[in-house]
Interface confidence: low
């Protein structure tokens, strides 16, 4: 007699989470009689999953009516695929006795779950930093199968090339995992930039989801700083300034000090913002000439973002100031930064 | 580097039939999706539609179903467009052009292009 | 079907102009827009997708922006080898379509 083939004609079968799976599988023979039962997993580890006789199995159905007279179709289908169905599912053949003995196994079918990513979070660094500095960038995506899936990294619209990326795990798994860290050269003009991590994947079927990272967050760009006097007044008051300017974030803290006395401290707010994301503020103090007897040694003093302070002194000469109108004077630094360092 | 390298032109009699080639190099065929753009003389581009390279399954815009048939021969990396029952009408360059992201087996925007090929329909 | 039209259909320039093609969308599309440059006899070359996006290779001075239903190219300043016709084309909804194109000749 010829002998009992068990046939399962997919080596494969990929299949979305969600969705329901059919895993093929005839038999060549009626005979000798013995149930069909599907395990996932070869060897004594195997797990049974579907068995006619006994046992509850929600999740799976026949596709055929096995218990239909000369039935040869021992196909079932599993609904609601999650990424842990996974695995080599075969259909095994047994001959009836007590117990029933295994007889033939069909090779097997993989079953492959394609489950999409989750949407990409992109995290910036902890602390803010200045231009010409590298800061970096980690954009993580979870839950995908199968393994290949690509990452790319763009900055306003310019793909990054600093990038490093792992899937993990390394080996076989239900589902996977990628990080991926993108090195940023920040410039000044970065406060409206944008970084966008892009994953593309087998489940997307469409645009590749993105996520989002302003630079706006991790960027500080310090202030330049000018003092300058304006002409004297009729009422013996002249006029300095001190123009803080090309400053992110906003945080910003001036005080005056007349030779060396904190005169007035101001906080900046609600300041308008420069086409380029960057703030401006000029301060203004008063000096009534006619009150000091030498010159008067003013300093504009600037804490931004939680640094160091910046300072930038004028001198204020009280002898070369008679009752007439001077004109504009810049400041003579005197300070210890004529400007910041970038 | 990547490619995709269209068959020469061809001439053909109304009522004949003509395969297309485009054959894909540098990249692994199966993981973009393939689309056919017509473009008749001095005319603009128009969506014919995409095979899907993972699972073969085509997508045809509504004026190409019927004499339009896009197919595939993964083992040459090569997507075919066929068009049976040739009309005057259908005399056109046709390109190949692949949709831009990895595994991404949609229509979508186009990243290579093939270098096109003239059919013309005349008798 | 997504309509899609773009102005003008004709556009003279000078080297180192700056030229501003916009093209519009009969539906909002979101961000699904992409832009394409062809020459005479050659096949259409990408240039930006997903409206702002440049492809790698494709010069600084192309830029796209627009969300919704209406979209701009911009050449910042026009070189000899960018007269040609640009095509848009929308694939937020099937089936895909492209616009019948802006000619740029030289002035």
């Known amino acids: 007699e010829e002998e009992l083939q068990v046939i399962q004609p997919e080596k494969s079968v990929s299949v979305a989470a969600g969705d329901s799976a059919t895993l093929n599988c005839t038999v060549s023979s009626l005979i000798p009689v013995g149930p069909i039962q599907w395990f996932r997993g070869a060897g004594p580890g195997r797990e049974l999953i579907y068995n006619l006789k006994e046992g509850h199995f929600p999740r799976v159905t026949p596709v055929s009516d096995p218990t239909k007279r000369n039935n040869m179709d021992f196909s079932i289908r599993i609904s609601n695929i999650t990424p842990a169905d996974a695995g080599t599912y075969y259909c095994v053949k047994f001959r009836k006795g007590s117990p029933d003995v295994e007889l033939k196994s069909g090779a097997g079918t993989e079953l492959s779950v394609r489950a999409k990513p989750s949407a990409p979070v992109v995290s910036g660094p902890a602390v803010r930093a200045t231009a010409e500095h590298t800061v970096s960038f980690t954009c993580e995506s979870h839950g995908f199968s199968p393994r290949d899936i690509t990452l790319k990294w763009f900055k306003n619209g310019n793909e990054l090339s600093d990038v490093q990326t792992n899937v993990d795990p390394a080996g076989k798994s239900v589902s996977y995992s990628i990080r991926s860290t993108a090195r940023v050269v920040l410039t000044r003009r970065d406060v409206h930039s944008q970084v966008i991590c892009e994953v593309a994947h087998v489940t997307l079927q469409g645009d590749p989801l993105r996520g989002t990272a302003n630079l706006s967050e991790a960027i500080r760009v310090p202030p330049f700083l000018e003092v300058t006097q304006q002409s004297m007044r009729a009422d013996n008051q002249v006029n300095v300034t001190c123009q803080v300017t090309k400053f992110y974030p906003q945080r910003l803290q001036l005080t005056w000090l007349e030779n060396g006395n904190v005169s007035r401290t101001e906080m900046a707010s609600a300041l308008p913002e420069n086409k380029d994301g960057t703030y401006n503020w000029t301060s203004w103090l008063l000096v009534n000439v006619s009150a000091h007897r030498d010159d008067v040694k003013l300093t504009c003093q600037v804490e931004h973002d939680g640094q160091p302070a910046v300072n930038k002194s004028f001198s204020v000469k009280v002898s070369a100031h008679p009752k007439e109108q001077g004109s504009n004077t810049a400041a003579e630094n005197t300070g210890t930064n004529e400007r910041n360092i970038y | 580097q990547i490619q995709l390298v269209q068959s020469g032109s061809e001439l053909k009699k109304p009522g004949a039939s003509v395969k297309v080639s485009c054959k894909a190099s540098?990249?692994?065929?199966?993981?973009?999706?393939m689309n056919w753009v017509r473009q008749a003389p001095g005319q603009g581009l128009e969506w014919m539609g995409f095979?899907?390279?993972?699972?073969?399954?085509?997508t045809y815009a509504q004026g190409f179903k019927g004499r339009f048939v896009f197919s595939l021969d993964t083992s040459v990396s090569t997507a075919y467009l066929q068009i049976s029952s040739l009309k005057a009408e259908d005399t056109a360059v046709y390109y190949c052009a692949r949709t831009r992201g990895y595994y991404d087996f949609d229509g979508g925007a186009f990243d290579y292009w093939g270098q096109g090929t003239l059919v013309t329909v005349s008798s | 079907d997504i309509q899609m039209t773009q102005s003008p259909s004709r556009l003279g320039a000078s080297v180192g102009d700056r030229v501003t093609i916009t093209c519009r969308a009969s539906q909002n599309v979101g961000t699904h827009l992409a832009w394409y440059q062809q020459k005479p006899g050659k096949a259409p070359k990408s240039l930006i997708y997903s409206a702002i996006y440049r492809y790698i290779g494709v010069p600084s001075r192309f830029s796209g922006s627009g969300s919704g239903t209406d979209f701009t190219l911009t050449i910042s300043s026009l070189q000899p080898e960018d007269f040609a016709t640009y095509f848009c084309q929308q694939y937020n909804t099937y089936p895909l379509t492209f616009d019948q194109g802006t000619k740029l000749e030289i002035k």
């Open positions: 095979i899907n390279t993972y699972t073969g399954e085509p």
């Open positions: 540098g990249y692994s065929i199966t993981n973009y999706a």
